[in-house]
Amino acid sequence: MVPPPENVRMNSVNFKNILQWESPAFAKGNLTFTAQYLSYRIFQDKCMNTTLTECDFSSLSKYGDHTLRVRAEFADEHSDWVNITFCPVDDTIIGPPGMQVEVLADSLHMRFLAPKIENEYETWTMKNVYNSWTYNVQYWKNGTDEKFQITPQYDFEVLRNLEPWTTYCVQVRGFLPDRNKAGEWSEPVCEQTTHDETVPS
């Protein structure tokens, strides 16, 4: 009897959908695997007789409820199928946005770039797919624990009237208010403000 794949899960970030699993212990030799997806009542092969422990399902519709399955094989024997269901638009992880930060005196000027949908040729982004897309920004004085959050209305934001000659750190994530779903935070970007430009009267 061939044991089934273990710890079968979908690792999906920005619609790059990778089904992953672990090979079970099997004394007779090396196992291969076949992964399939359900397409209108028929299971279609996606990865056949592969020695890998993952399979790319990124071509599946972003909007469908998909049934995927994988089994282990050895010679003419095979395990039972292990099934999972997956809806990309609901289940994919929203990766961190890009962010450009520029210091202008006592202000930080930030521009945000929505994460690109993986593996498509053109420049469609996660913002295209999700109508309610917005950004959360959090910032703090470097070396302190207190963090401040804002929700910019646009793809840019300016933090004004900051303390001069002080290093501030900023990070951004995508947020979907209608789903109450937050993406991953970007890596912090830390920049030092310069002087306060106000001129004494």
């Epitope: 997806y37 071509s59 053109e122």
Partner: nanobody, 126 residues
Framework: QVQLQESGGGSVQAGGSLRLSCAAS????????MGWFRQAPGKEREGVAA???????RYADSVKGRFTISKDNAKKILYLQMNSLKVEDTAMYYC????????????????????WGQGTQVTVSS
């Protein structure tokens, strides 16, 4: 939300022609990958032709040289020109769309398209 509405089906003699249309609304039309599928009674739904947002096309072997898929981005309409029709082309024809899609995956399978029309019947008699 994407809405798709097919038209242009009907009855025709073998060797004749039909042009199917699929009107789309919602999303940015130029971002769609689109396809025509068909389902004959008692058979599974199968891909007929597909067109990516960049205009590249693919056809099932059974219709190559006879069917032509095209789209008018300005009018938001997908077409399927069917010539030299055969009795075995008889089926319900469905239009499908996947928004925010380019040519990366050469989509041809039902599960690769998220939005579907209600279908239009094509009957070819001998």
């Amino acid at each position: 939300q994407v809405q798709l509405q097919e038209s242009g089906g009907g009855s025709v003699q073998a060797g004749g022609s039909l042009r199917l249309s699929c009107a789309a609304s919602g999303y940015t039309y130029s971002s769609y990958c689109m396809g025509w599928f068909r389902q004959a009674p008692g058979k599974e739904r199968e891909g007929v032709a597909a067109i990516d947002s960049d205009g590249s096309t693919r056809y099932a072997d059974s219709v190559k040289g006879r069917f032509t898929i095209s789209k008018d981005n300005a009018k938001k309409i997908l077409y399927l020109q069917m010539n030299s029709l055969k009795v075995e082309d008889t089926a319900m024809y469905y239009c499908a769309a996947e928004p925010y899609c380019s040519g990366g995956y050469k989509r041809t399978m039902v599960a690769e398209f998220g939005f579907w029309g209600q279908g239009t019947q094509v009957t070819v008699s001998s």
